[in-house]
């Protein structure tokens, strides 16, 4: 694979994870109820990371925005953040990228130049798509812990009616913004990773391209290592550089989006 | 205006089929949740179906689940109840009604009267 | 399946008097997600269908009367009627509308002396 071709496609598969990192995080379904202990429920409750919403079989949904900073969870408020920070990283990442593309020409930037800023943008993108695999990935463990501790007391306070009457506490499982972030999130890293591969393509090798001219005893003649590269002339200016063919492929984008059912 | 408005309620011998529609008016069907409610000679209301809003899911009550089948055409406005393999005991007189906030049914139609009698 | 137990089955009252019915659930009503009950009261009149009167165990339905008011969470509602017309009696029914089956409770009947 050409170095250009690498970077351009480093960026699109960042930029497809990156616009799936802002969707997951704006999305309201992080959360869904668990519908196996009630499977035929009229209401169906789903929470995302800004407000929690109820959708009745009537075909009304009703959301709540989380309207408090202070009596929210830490962990809610740490995934929030860690979002947001693979969103900022993210547009910066794109812009710098965007600079950084072979295929764009900006003035007189030259290679090592762009090598940088091709880097730069590669390890905003690795660490935008480390920042939304965590984040995820905190919130579904918070999830599963708070699963098995409402399981273990699923039917609480056993009052009223002597007894006899079952309060069933809602549970809550993976929504489809979980999947979403994942798949987001190692878009965002595989793109990045290319990015940096593609850096390396772009960056100059100095004894490729630095004439060296030395005299021999009795002879003048000037010898350009690496100059007799297969047609590219004596006095070129062409630069030969490494192409990395290496393992920067995706699986053919084979990114699978979660349905979302409508359990109610 | 909206209106509901049943049709489709017979006399019929146990084991027979009767197809209920529900002609809905002042609003577009496929936006809510429908459900039929049937009133038995001795006064008692007794959900029946609900299919919700877009028509994804439907929910049968027990003593009419694999015999009755809930049902819409967008299009015409109109909500069905398709009903089969009728006993005694299915006879009511059946309501249609939209689903409103809370599930709570807004409006119902006057109903039709379903006899299932030898 | 919810069951719901209407109390009492009937009641004979005067016209003005304050009126109060009480409906139970065998599983708690109250939705975590909006803390909301999903119980619904309706009204209905000798050859008429049901009227909808209160949803939300307590948000009374836009042209009813402000003398009906419905209370409780949880398992344990109450629709009171503070003054009573003779329009008022009819058969009121309570409705879990929270889990399917959607079931109804038997009906107060409300009755003039």
């Known amino acids: 694979m050409s170095v250009t071709a690498c970077q351009g496609l480093g960026f699109v598969v960042s930029l497809i994870g990156f616009a799936g990192i802002i969707a997951a995080t704006c999305m309201d379904q992080w959360s869904t109820q668990d519908l196996y202990n009630n499977p035929v429920t009229a209401v169906f409750n789903y929470q995302g990371l800004w407000r929690s919403c109820v959708r009745e079989s009537s075909g009304f949904t009703e959301c709540r925005g989380y309207f408090t900073l202070l009596g929210l969870p830490a962990m809610l408020q740490a995934v929030r953040a860690l979002m947001i920070v693979g969103i900022v990283l993210g547009v910066i990442g794109i812009l710098v990228s965007i600079f950084a593309l072979k295929c764009i020409r900006i003035g007189s930037m030259d290679d090592s130049a762009k090598a940088k800023m091709t880097l730069t943008s590669g390890i905003l993108f690795i660490i935008s798509g480390i920042c939304a695999i965590i984040g995820v990935s905190v919130f579904a463990n918070m999830l599963v812990t708070n699963f098995w501790m409402s399981t273990a007391n699923m039917y609480s306070g056993m009052g009223g009616m002597g007894g006899m009457v079952q309060t069933v506490q809602t549970r809550y499982t993976f929504g489809a913004a979980l999947f979403v972030g994942w798949v987001a999130g190692g878009l965002t890293l595989i793109g990045g990773v290319m990015m940096c591969i593609a850096c390396r393509g772009l960056t100059p090798d100095d004894s490729n391209f630095k004439a060296v001219s030395y005299h021999a005893s009795g002879q003048n003649v000037a010898y350009r290592p690496g100059g007799f590269k297969a047609s590219t002339g004596f006095g070129s200016n062409t630069r030969n550089k490494k192409i990395y063919d290496g393992g920067a492929r995706t699986e053919d984008d084979e990114q699978s989006h979660p349905t979302k059912y409508d359990y109610v | 205006e909206v209106q509901l408005v049943e049709s489709g309620g017979d006399l019929v011998q146990p084991g027979g089929s009767l197809k209920l529609s529900c002609a809905a008016s002042?609003?577009?069907?496929?936006?809510?949740?429908m459900s039929w409610v049937r009133q038995t000679p001795d006064k008692r209301l007794e959900w029946v179906s609900t299919?919700?809003?877009?028509?994804?899911?439907?929910y049968y009550s027990d003593s009419v689940k694999g015999r009755f089948s809930i049902s819409r055409d967008n299009a015409r406005n109109t909500l069905y109840l398709q009903m089969s393999s009728l006993k005694s005991e299915d006879t009511a007189m059946y309501y249609c009604?939209?689903?409103?906030?809370?599930?709570?049914?807004?409006?119902w139609g006057q109903g039709t009267a379903v006899t299932v009698s030898s | 399946d919810i069951v719901m137990t209407q109390s009492p089955s009937s009641l004979t009252v005067t016209a003005g008097e304050k009126v109060t019915m009480s409906c139970k659930s065998s599983?708690?009503?109250?939705?975590?997600?909006?803390?909301?009950?999903?119980l619904t009261w309706y009204q209905q009149k000798p050859g008429q269908p049901p009227k909808l009167l209160i949803y939300?165990?307590?948000t009374r339905e836009s042209g009813v009367p402000d003398r009906f008011t419905g209370s409780g969470s949880g398992t344990h509602f109450t629709l009171t009627i503070s003054s009573v017309q003779a329009e008022d009696l009819a058969v009121y029914y309570c409705?879990?509308?929270?889990?399917?089956?959607?079931?109804f409770g038997a009906g107060t009947k409300l009755e003039l002396k």
């Open positions: 009604g939209r689903l409103y906030y809370g599930n709570a049914m807004d409006y």
């Open positions: 002042g609003f577009t069907l496929s936006r809510y949740g």
């Open positions: 939300w165990a307590s």
């Open positions: 409705q879990n509308d929270y889990s399917y089956p959607l079931t």
């Open positions: 599983q708690s009503l109250l939705n975590s997600g909006n803390q909301k009950n999903y």
């Open positions: 299919i919700i809003s877009g028509g994804i899911n439907t």
